[in-house]
Each structure stands twice: as structure tokens, then as C-alpha cells.
């Protein structure tokens, strides 16, 4: 056959289902490849063919829409599975064509079994709530365009095993949960099930979230060095190893860059002849707040090094802050021990 | 579609057990709940406890705990419920009825369990 | 466990006629109500599910409607093949429970 733009096998588009629900999958050629929509493509003559190979497999082979019910059937550029089976799993490939054009992508399709609470190998989108912040809401994801809007699902939330009733502070509302006030005990997986008939027949939808309560904007401040700090001094002597901790808190701010960096007389460590190592360790708290360690090392320490200027810098999208190390050179202790031990007669 | 198929009636002495099969066809086995209800002769419906197939949980209602066991053999796509200690009251019209979520959206037709000496 | 009273335990009607059920918990069970329907000797058939969705297949002058601890099925014309037993079952917490039942006959 003539030569096809074959885009490769699109990894970045795991798409995962569960076992026995419904699941649209549409063809990624006009999502991610294409400068075209299947509209136009339809109307330029261009006809997309599917064909999938199953898991373990190397032959390609076409899918079989003639199955009882119309398990699996095409429309536009989707393809419908109602209901997905377990050796649905494989690589799917959508083609578009004409005599004189060919383009295609596969896409792997994982189809995955859920235990009685609702885990599974689905990978789970993480959606975060501010704490204390007044009234949020989680909707139930990646549920349109499976029924019309005539048709009333019903929905039941579930939060880990068990259905979301009489909870303080969350309120299923449809397909949305409302939290009133989330707090740290609010942290979890939440499932959404959504019902609904079709052609005599009863589907299910399941959606996975997982909730994380992070800090609010209300409370977030510019970041804080609590080292280095005024009341501790560096005092070393020529041939020690200096270490000088620079410990900086950032309050959760979302989709911000935290950052810290030393400058050794106002320059970046990488640009001075020094023989600096920075090691760096970050760790979390509950609400994603965060603090960032950067340990500054200079292994045999020079009388010039410790005349220097050591600084801390840090940024959020708060703002920046600098903090100078304070460094010092130790001076010689008078060696009493001589004439203290003459002094007590000592011979 | 969706079929569940149950073994046929059972005369029982008391005292004696009593499994009754509930053969699942149509849609996958081990991702819906299945429940067992009973009905003796001229009275409502009784939930005994269900049981999750793919993993095996199961929650009994305190009434049959102890007495009742509800297994799942996943390869065969059939339920089992085993009552034990059979009484005369215990003389009823036994259900399988499978649900995705908690609601019993298909039934399988009956076995009548008959305990009498 | 949560009892489920219903109301009439039986009731007599003419083809064409509006027919109501009741059920009352003993607790609110936050909409989690279901219906079936039995007939003579057969299993019982899933109605409406989260007290007003109806499943799928059922005719649609069944209708659910309630909050709370009152719930309502509403056969809108009653039909000759709707004599049956209805029964109302709550699925808020375990153990699930079962009113128990109503008989629909026609006049």
C-alpha cells in the first residue's frame, strides 16, 4: 500500500476505562496531529478507518462493529464501546484517508477491573481544595457527551467505600460535591457513578478523584528564611569545612515556581572558582506547604572565602527575599593553659 | 443481556446446609454486586447479604451472620449462598439479584428451599 | 436497621386510574429508595432506583418521587399487566430493608 504519515503509537494518551462501562474514545489525529477537524476531513472526502491489535499481539486487525447490540460501533470520530470487556485491552489505530492522502496514531486502551471500593490501576486526577476557603465543588469528570441532555443520570458519590449521606461539611449536589469548609480530614478518593438507561439498557459511569486540602491563598505570605538568621554566626578557621543551611518556607501557592539560590559575592556559585557544593532537600506539610533546604558546602574553607558574602534568595510568586549568612573568621584563642597551670604551682 | 440462572428446589431436613448456585451471564461477573434475598411463602422480601466477586467482599445482614456464606467462583461466573442449620422457618424462595451500585437491577428466577422432616 | 412501612398493603383500581403507594423510613435515607415490582410468581423487577430514576425499560407512567423519609410510586394510568406486588426497599445503609409490599389488583 502507498505510504501513510504514521504518527506513532501516542503514549502520552493512556487512556484508561473500566471494565463493563461505557467509554468514548475519540480519534487523537484531530486533537493533537492534525490542523483539521473531522468535519472537514469528512467533507474533503477523507473517510477514518479503525483497526486495533490486542494486547500481546503483533497482528493488526480490524474491529469488529457487527457485535450483538453494538458493542462497539463508530460515530464521526469517536468510537463507542457499550460496554467495554476486559479483552478490549490493546493499541487502537485510527486512519484517515483518501487515494491520496494517509495519515494514522494508535493510542493504547487499557481496559481495567475495580474492586468493591472503587480502587483500581486507574490513574487518578488530583483536584485541590483550598482549607478553610467557604464553599468549593468537585464535579464529576469526563462525563459529557455519553447521554443526551434529555436524559436525567443519576449520580452517587462515594467517598473511599461508602456513599456520601449525612456528612458535615459535604453535600452531593448531582454531579457536583460540594465541601462547605474542607479540611484536612477531607483528603481522600471521592467516586462519582453516574446512571443512565439507553435503548432499554442501564449504564454506569464510574469516576475516580482524589481530594487534596492545601493551603489557601487567604494565608499565603511571601516566603520566610528562617536560616540563615541573625543570632547564628558561621565562625570557622582556614582549613575547616563550612556548611551554612539556607531554610526557606513557602505557603502553598497553586501552579507557583518556588525557587532558592545562593550568591557568593552576589554571584551565582556556578560562576565563581570556588569549590562549592549545594545539596538540596524539600519536604511538605499536610497543606503543601513547602520547605526547601539548600545546604551551601565548601569543603576546606579559605581565609578569603570567609571574608565573602554568603546570601540566601528566595521567590514565590508571593515575592523575593534575600537573607545574608553571617560569616567570620575564627580568631586564635590566647593559649591560657601554660600560664594557668604555672599559677597553680604545677612543675 | 443480563442473565442469572439458579439451581432448582431443594427439599432439606433441618439441621442439614443447603447451597444454592446462581449462574451470571451477560455482563462482567466480577465488577457488580451480587445479593441474595429471600421470600418465604405469602410474606415480603428479606435481604440476606451480598457479595463483590472481584474481590470477594461480602456484608451479611446480622439476622443470617454466621449461618449464611456467599462465595464467588469468577471462573464459572457463579454465585454461591450456603445456609446452614436449615429450620423450618427457613422454608422460602431464594434470589440472587446482581447490582452494579447498590440497587438490584436484575433477578435471577427463585429457588425454592423446602426444610421439613 | 431501618424499618420501611407501606401504605395501603393493598389496594383495588380500575384500568385508566391514577394509583399511589407510600413508604415511610424510619430515618432519612437521603433519596437511597428503590421500587420493584413482583408478580405472581416471579422475581421482582427493579422499577425506580435513587427514588425517582427510572430503570431502564420500565414504562414511563411509573413515576417515584419523595425526600427524606416519605416516598411515593405513582402509576399514572393503571394498566391490566401492572397487577403486581410492589415493594419499596431503602439502600442508605446496611442492612438494605423492604416495605413490605403493596398488592395491586384491578377492579
Known amino acids: 500500500s502507498e505510504r501513510c504519515d504514521d504518527w506513532g503509537l501516542d503514549t502520552m494518551r493512556q487512556i484508561q476505562v473500566f471494565e463493563d462501562e461505557p467509554a468514548r474514545i475519540k480519534c487523537p489525529l484531530f486533537e493533537h496531529f492534525l490542523k483539521f477537524n473531522y468535519s472537514t476531513a469528512h467533507s474533503a472526502g477523507l473517510t477514518l478507518i479503525w483497526y486495533w491489535t490486542r494486547q500481546d499481539r503483533d497482528l493488526e486487525e480490524p474491529i469488529n462493529f457487527r457485535l450483538p447490540e453494538n458493542r462497539i460501533s463508530k460515530e464521526k470520530d469517536v468510537l463507542w464501546f457499550r460496554p467495554t470487556l476486559l479483552n478490549d485491552t490493546g493499541n487502537y489505530t485510527c486512519m484517515l484517508r483518501n487515494t491520496t492522502y494517509c495519515s494514522k496514531v494508535a493510542f493504547p486502551l487499557e481496559v481495567v477491573q475495580k474492586d468493591s471500593c472503587f480502587n483500581s490501576p486507574m490513574k487518578l486526577p488530583v483536584h485541590k481544595l483550598y482549607i478553610e476557603y467557604g464553599i468549593q465543588r468537585i464535579t464529576c469528570p469526563n462525563v459529557d457527551g455519553y447521554f443526551p441532555s434529555s436524559v436525567k443520570p443519576t449520580i452517587t458519590w462515594y467517598m473511599g467505600c461508602y456513599k456520601i449521606q449525612n456528612f458535615n461539611n459535604v453535600i452531593p449536589e448531582g454531579m457536583n460535591l460540594s465541601f462547605l469548609i474542607a479540611l484536612i480530614s477531607n483528603n481522600g478518593n471521592y467516586t462519582c457513578v453516574v446512571t443512565y438507561p439507553e435503548n432499554g439498557r442501564t449504564f454506569h459511569l464510574t469516576r475516580t478523584l482524589t481530594v487534596k486540602v492545601v493551603g489557601s491563598p487567604k494565608n499565603a505570605v511571601p516566603p520566610v528564611i528562617h536560616s540563615p538568621n541573625d543570632h547564628v554566626v558561621y565562625e570557622k578557621e582556614p582549613g575547616e569545612e563550612l556548611l551554612i543551611p539556607c531554610t526557606v518556607y513557602f505557603s502553598f501557592l497553586m501552579d507557583s515556581r518556588n525557587e532558592v539560590w545562593w550568591t557568593i559575592d552576589g554571584k551565582k556559585p556556578d560562576d565563581i572558582t570556588i569549590d562549592v557544593t549545594i545539596n538540596e532537600s524539600i519536604s511538605h506539610s499536610r497543606t503543601e506547604d513547602e520547605t526547601r533546604t539548600q545546604i551551601l558546602s565548601i569543603k576546606k574553607v579559605t581565609s578569603e572565602d570567609l571574608k565573602r558574602s554568603y546570601v540566601c534568595h528566595a521567590r514565590s510568586a508571593k515575592g523575593e527575599v534575600a537573607k545574608a549568612a553571617k560569616v567570620k573568621q575564627k580568631v586564635p584563642a590566647p593559649r591560657y593553659t601554660v600560664e594557668l597551670a604555672c599559677g597553680f604551682g604545677a612543675t | 443481556q443480563v442473565q442469572l440462572v439458579q439451581s432448582g428446589a431443594e427439599v432439606k431436613k433441618p439441621g442439614s446446609s443447603v447451597k444454592v448456585s446462581c449462574k451470571a451471564s451477560g455482563y462482567a461477573f466480577t465488577s457488580s454486586w451480587m445479593n441474595w434475598v429471600r421470600q418465604a411463602p405469602g410474606q415480603g422480601l428479606e435481604w440476606m447479604g451480598r457479595i463483590y466477586p472481584g474481590d470477594g467482599n461480602t456484608h451479611y445482614a446480622q439476622k443470617f451472620q454466621g449461618r449464611v456464606t456467599l462465595t464467588a467462583d469468577k471462573s464459572t461466573s457463579t454465585a454461591y449462598m450456603e445456609l446452614s442449620s436449615l429450620r423450618s422457618e427457613d422454608t422460602a424462595v431464594y434470589y440472587c439479584?446482581?447490582?452494579?451500585?447498590?440497587?438490584?437491577?436484575?433477578w435471577g428466577q427463585g429457588t425454592l428451599v423446602t426444610v421439613s422432616s | 436497621d431501618i424499618q420501611m412501612t407501606q401504605s395501603p398493603s393493598s389496594l383495588s383500581a380500575s384500568v385508566g386510574d391514577r394509583v399511589t403507594i407510600t413508604c415511610q423510613a424510619s430515618q432519612g435515607i437521603n433519596n437511597y429508595l428503590n421500587w420493584y415490582q413482583q408478580k405472581p410468581g416471579k422475581a421482582p423487577k427493579l422499577l425506580i432506583h435513587?427514588?425517582?430514576g427510572l430503570h431502564a425499560g420500565v414504562p414511563s407512567r411509573f413515576s417515584g418521587s419523595g425526600s427524606g423519609t416519605d416516598f411515593t410510586l405513582t402509576i399514572s394510568s393503571l394498566e391490566p399487566e401492572d397487577v403486581a406486588t410492589y415493594y419499596c426497599q431503602q439502600y442508605s445503609i446496611l442492612p438494605w430493608t423492604f416495605g413490605g409490599g403493596t398488592k395491586v389488583e384491578i377492579k
Open positions: 435513587y427514588t425517582s
Open positions: 439479584g446482581e447490582g452494579y451500585l447498590d440497587p438490584m437491577d436484575y
